[in-house]
């Protein structure tokens, strides 16, 4: 990671030596590098109880580089920060903290939510569903003949899965009772039950009340972790595809 790493080359004067290795400009037998060659960063490395000076081409993780007229120095990021751009801006927080505009927080501000994978405060994503598809044909036990009452269903797609704090998806399946024109079943279509049913008098004013499918209600209640993984990816695909038009298709 850090190519130019220099320490003292051989035993010289115990304090300062000019015969330094690699990136060191000056070094001491005991403290390692004291100053670095141009463009290299000076950092202190802890070895046991002692700190040794090293010269690096870039600062290690957990440190940021500052260029001064006389020295380029690596400085440690704040305690809650894993990697930082400078002393004011963290780019990755330590476990248990969430990144919001360069700072590490215990909790995210209102209107944002904690993403436990990226350890960032991110936008809350609500569920988005398409419009309903047309109702299916009216059927009873998979048949469209030989009965008066049956059920029909319609479905819609989830365009955007919600994030952990997002609104849950509404049902994606709907079933309602329906009536069909009395129609003779073709040979081989009709079963015993079909013949019995045929004799029943038609029921006037049949209800067509839609009932959300219990299966679809369950499927919309995914656990937050499952939702969170998929949502960023799907959102990006939908938005990038639609470019300058709104991605919402909920009406």
């Amino acid at each position: 990671q850090n190519a130019s790493r220099g320490r003292r080359q051989r035993r010289m004067h115990p304090n300062v030596s000019q015969g330094c290795q690699g990136g060191c400009a000056t070094c001491s037998d005991y403290n390692g590098c004291l100053s670095c060659k141009p463009r290299l960063f000076f950092a202190l490395e802890r070895i046991g109880m002692k700190q040794i000076g090293v010269c690096l081409s870039s600062c290690p993780s957990g440190y940021y580089g500052t260029r001064y007229p006389d020295i380029n120095k690596c400085t440690k990021c704040k305690a809650d920060c894993d990697t930082c751009f400078n002393k004011n801006f963290c780019t990755k927080c330590k476990s248990g903290f969430y990144l919001h505009l360069g700072k590490c927080l215990d909790n995210c501000p209102e209107g944002l939510e904690a993403n436990n994978h990226t350890m960032e405060c991110v936008s809350i994503v609500h569920c988005e569903v398409s419009e309903w598809n047309p109702w299916s044909p009216c059927t009873k036990k998979g048949k469209t003949c030989g009965f008066k009452r049956g059920t029909e269903t319609r479905v819609r797609e989830i365009i955007q899965h919600p994030s952990a704090k997002g609104n849950l998806c509404p049902p994606t399946n709907e079933t309602r009772k329906c009536t069909v024109q009395r129609k003779k079943c073709q040979k081989g279509e009709r079963g015993k039950k079909g013949r019995e049913r045929k004799r029943k008098k038609p029921n006037k004013g049949e209800s067509k009340e839609a009932i959300p499918d219990s299966k679809s209600l369950e499927s919309s209640k995914e656990i937050p972790e499952q939702r969170e993984n998929k949502q960023q990816q799907k959102k990006r695909k939908v938005q990038d595809k639609q470019k300058s038009v709104s991605v919402s298709t909920v009406h």
Partner: antibody
Framework: QIQLQESGPGLVKPSQSLSLTCSVT?????????WNWIRQFPGNKLEWMGY???????NYNPSLKDRISITRDTSMNQFFLKLNSVTTEDTATYYC??????????WGAGTTVTVSS | DIQMTQSPASLSASVGETVTITCRTS??????LAWFHQKQGKSPQLLVY???TLADGVSSRFSGSGSGTQYSLKINSLQPEDFGNYYC?????????FGGGTKLEIK
């Protein structure tokens, strides 16, 4: 160096949609933090409208939530504002801006939009 | 929404003077507050972020301070280019609201 440039029609009729584009140069919109739309009304009052973040997710000002949409085209490095059902109250100078780690905040020059019949 | 109350709404000062503009928030914004300067016909320019960090290229005559719900921007030794409008904005909870602005005029 990063630059943002707003473009779009200067005049929009009431009840129509206002559509603006922010073209970004010198930085990828998939790398930045938050790509915002902000407007300034004739009396100089500023209003944050919303953003699209680097990962394509949005946040909008609740006062505009039913009318606003911010989308993007990553191949063109542009992001867009669409404001529906405009009224004369939406007459303002519209700015796009970005919040970045390195620069923290940069604004475009702004584009004036008048809503009038 | 967090309300931002900026004061004074306007002030007149002479070149060389020191002025202070304040911004009070209806609830804590945890130092996620920025100050902007806007000259006539131009877009706002960032001066200070995280309440007290000076943005790149901004004169050290500007300084931000405060915490919780009270923040201020101090301008030492006013220069002709400092005149114009000043705004505070928070970046805490959504929506990120602005203060009403302070118009700084030459006396």
């Amino acid at each position: 160096q990063i630059q943002l440039q707003e473009s779009g029609p200067g005049l929009v009729k009431p009840s129509q949609s206002l559509s603006l584009t922010c073209s970004v140069t010198g930085y990828s919109i998939t790398s930045g933090y938050y790509w915002n739309w902000i407007r300034q009304f004739p009396g100089n009052k500023l209003e944050w409208m919303g953003y699209i973040s680097y990962d394509g997710t949005n946040n909008y000002n609740p006062s505009l939530k039913d009318r606003i949409s911010i989308t993007r085209d990553t191949s063109m490095n542009q992001f867009f504002l669409k404001l529906n059902s405009v009224t004369t109250e939406d007459t303002a100078t519209y700015y796009c801006s970005v919040l970045l780690i390195q620069y923290f905040n940069i604004w475009g020059a702004g584009t004036t939009v008048t809503v009038s019949s | 929404d967090i309300q931002m109350t900026q004061s004074p709404a306007s002030l007149s000062a002479s070149v060389g003077e020191t002025v202070t503009i304040t911004c009070r928030t209806s609830e804590s914004v945890n130092n996620f507050l920025a100050w902007f300067h806007q000259k006539q016909g131009k877009s706002p320019q960032l001066l200070v972020y995280h309440a007290k960090t000076l943005a790149d290229g901004v004169s050290s005559r500007f300084s931000g301070s405060g915490s919780g719900t009270q923040y201020s921007l101090k301008i030492n030794s006013l220069q002709p280019e400092d005149f114009g409008n000043y705004y505070c904005q928070h970046f805490w909870s959504i929506p990120w609201t602005f203060g009403g602005g302070t118009k700084l005029e030459i006396k």
